[in-house]
Interface confidence: low
């Protein structure tokens, strides 16, 4: 006969980064024991194993160690799967296959979603605007999934559909950044609204911009930033300093402050119309509101990531305007190297051994140096590889091949060129024959 396996009909909707439960249940017969149970979760399309329970034991996750069963509930027929730290790539169908004496299976769909950020609005050109000018308004919203629907309307709520170009680009995590561009001819003034809708979450994020043609600026504001790059450790907060000299009688209502990425012109943070308009950069930026009136336009960037590295432009407009760019150099210290030996037992003088030095999660790429016990550099037969993880941090693996003497010490030094931080490890090989690591 067939075992009845039950799963929800509707897709399970899970936010990126959260945990999801894929429900699956069966009805155990009286006297059922877990020793009889074979439970397999697999990807429906590819049949790739995700998680299994067999021979009375949880066989563990075969899916990047992000899955778990509910062991205390299995005996009651609860075969549900917990999927941790959901990613876009997890989206799809999962099959729950239960076998006792009989067997049955059913498939449950996982729909991944991520909310879009509040849109940021930029204007091009953004000065010397007069009625009749054609302007380009860009509405940008970040890190959502799945692809968004974008709607424009004017101040009266009338939809604007002509001259709209929308592009959506997925990042390495599969999340979308949406950029929608509206081209309009200015009236005396006007309000333009952009709405970004997530079709799965039915979440709307909207922003608007009101354009009032302005008179031409007459001179330049001197904007000062540090000449040297600001060095920030991954995960810490960084201050990008920027200052200007306010004139007597200056009021914040006169100030337009924009921080943007120098290369892409992506808006990072803005202060306009006497108000902090907030972060357009993953909600990780802040100004120093109490210091703005004194001419301090610095930007605080929180939880620095490798991807933040680059140049940021501070743009200040009062009656006049000026701008300057500051560079952010991101860094992360390398871990103390771990050393491994191959082969690692029955070693004798004259044997060729491979010593591997591994150091993790540093940035930028490391410099690796080997030396012997006398401090003499070892450069021959060294192969070093560096691989970036999803956060852009590097794991470095350096392999040294040497012919053993009677004994010897081999040291590996991993240097972070930005932090001027050295991390080193060494291994001493003595005696014959020997085993590494030494047995207790």
């Amino acid at each position: 006969g067939a075992l009845e396996v039950q799963v929800p009909e509707d897709p399970v909707v899970a936010l990126v980064g959260t945990d999801a439960t894929l429900c699956c249940s069966f009805s155990p017969e009286p006297g059922f024991s877990l020793a009889q149970l074979n439970l397999i979760w697999q990807l429906t399309d590819t049949k790739q194993l995700v998680h299994s329970f067999a021979e009375g034991q949880d066989q563990g996750s075969a899916y990047a160690n992000r899955t778990a069963l509910f062991p205390d509930l299995l005996a009651q027929g609860n075969a549900s799967l917990r999927l941790q730290r959901v990613r876009v790539a997890d989206e799809g169908s999962f099959t729950c296959f239960v076998s006792i004496r009989d067997f049955g299976s059913a498939a449950v769909s996982l729909q991944v979603a991520a909310p879009y950020s509040k849109p940021s609005m930029t204007l091009e050109p953004n000065k010397d605007l007069r009625p009749g000018d054609t302007v380009t308004i860009t509405c940008s919203s970040y890190q959502g999934y799945p692809e968004a629907e974008v709607f424009w309307q004017d101040g009266q709520g009338v939809p604007l559909t002509g001259n709209v170009t929308t592009s959506q680009m997925a990042n390495e995590q599969g999340l979308f950044d949406v950029h929608s561009i509206l081209r309009v001819v200015l009236g005396a003034n006007g309000t333009y609204s952009c709405l970004v809708r997530n079709p799965v979450l039915q979440q709307d994020a909207h922003s608007s911009v009101t354009i009032t043609p302005q008179r031409s600026p007459t001179g330049a504001v001197e904007v000062q930033v540090p000449e040297d790059p600001v060095v920030a450790l991954v995960g810490t907060d960084a201050t990008l300093r920027c200052s200007f000299s306010p004139e007597p009688g200056f009021s914040l209502a006169q100030l337009n402050l924009i921080w943007q990425l120098t290369d892409t012109k992506q808006l990072v943070h803005s202060f306009t119309e006497g108000r902090d308009q907030g972060s357009a950069y993953a909600n990780r930026t802040a100004l120093f509101p109490d210091l703005l009136a004194q001419g301090n336009a610095s930007l605080r960037l929180q939880r620095v990531r490798v991807a933040d590295e680059g140049s940021f432009t501070c743009f200040v407009s009062i009656r006049d305007f000026g701008s300057a760019a500051v560079s952010l150099q991101v860094a992360a210290p390398y871990s103390k190297p771990s050393m491994t030996l191959e082969p690692n037992k029955d070693l004798r003088p004259g044997d060729t051994v491979t010593i591997t030095c591994s150091s993790y999660r540093g940035y930028p790429e490391a410099e690796v140096f080997w030396q012997d016990g006398q401090g003499v550099p070892l450069t021959g037969n060294v192969t070093t590889s560096q691989m970036a993880n999803e956060q852009g941090l590097f794991d470095v693996h350096s392999v040294l091949r040497v012919v053993l003497g009677a004994n010897g010490t081999y040291s590996c030094l991993v240097r972070n060129p930005v932090l001027q931080q050295d991390a080193h490890g060494s291994v001493t090989i003595t005696g014959q024959p020997m085993t590494f690591p030494p047995e207790a």
């Epitope: 399309d45 590819t46 790739q48 194993l49 799945p146 979308f176």
Partner: antibody, heavy 120, light 108 residues
Framework: DVQLVESGGGVVRPGESLTLSCAAS????????VSWVRQAPGEGLEWVSG???????YYADSVKGRFTISRDNSNNTLYLQMNSLRAEDTAVYYC??????????????WGLGTLVTVSS | EVVLTQSPGTLTLSPGERATLSCRAS??????LAWYQQKPGQAPRLLIY???TRATGIPARFSGSGSGTEFTLTINSLQSEDFAVYYC??????????FGGGTKVEIK
């Protein structure tokens, strides 16, 4: 029936550019990941670049900054724009479909390939 | 990147014999390994994925095994059409997706 047909190969000089096309039929190109895989004469297979169903692009280190993968959903075609070509880029270039939306997977369908020769 | 090493480079056998092809990964790739067959002048053809699962239309004489770093493709009772080059490919750690150097199975 799923089919992939590559075109655009030919003989070029070092430093020149070439664009390869891969016309797909039997499936929607933005519902699956598709990659370019190359094979130098008498050598093994080397993955070059991939684009996922959602549009994420990846490149091998050997071509990063020189090659650009793209697709046109309206005509179900994949492209590989190859700039600054080198002699070591000489190979048969295959278009290969992954059997799911994310590109990091095995390839269940392959085209017949198109030969690119870079020679002075 | 994950390096895949295939051995032997060439395997010389007679029809009806069993072929055992090895693929070793430089670090664990769990079961994210596929095998392909390629004949001269043709594109590769998928044989096995997820280490053990035969692709559609692949005869039962082809089987895969292994996990972690050691993988094997076995062809029981070689047929004349099985003489070709075989490649393994990992899709666990990426980018890049990587292939082994290939094993040529030729007729004795």
């Amino acid at each position: 029936d799923v089919q992939l047909v590559e075109s655009g190969g030919g003989v070029v000089r070092p430093g020149e550019s070439l664009t390869l096309s891969c016309a797909a039929s039997g499936f929607t190109i933005n519902s699956y990941a598709v990659s370019w895989v190359r094979q130098a004469p008498g050598e093994g297979l080397e993955w070059v670049s991939g684009i996922s169903g959602s549009g994420v692009r990846y490149y091998a280190d050997s071509v990063k900054g020189r090659f650009t993968i793209s697709r046109d959903n309206s005509n179900n075609t994949l492209y590989l724009q190859m700039n600054s070509l080198r002699a070591e880029d000489t190979a048969v270039y295959y278009c290969a479909r992954s059997n799911k939306v994310t590109w990091n997977n095995f390839f269940d369908y392959w085209g017949l390939g198109t030969l690119v020769t870079v020679s002075s | 990147e994950v390096v895949l090493t295939q051995s032997p480079g060439t395997l010389t056998l007679s029809p009806g014999e069993r072929a055992t092809l090895s693929c070793r990964a430089s670090r664990s790739i769990l079961t994210s390994l596929a095998w392909y067959q390629q004949k001269p002048g043709q594109a590769p053809r998928l044989l096995i994925y997820n280490t053990v699962t035969r692709a559609t239309g692949i005869p039962a004489r082809f089987s895969g095994s292994g996990s972690g770093t050691e993988f094997t493709l076995t062809i029981n009772s070689l047929q004349s059409e099985d003489f070709a080059v075989y490649y393994c490919q990992q899709y666990y750690d990426w980018p890049p997706l990587t292939f082994g150097g290939g094993t040529k199975v030729e007729i004795k």
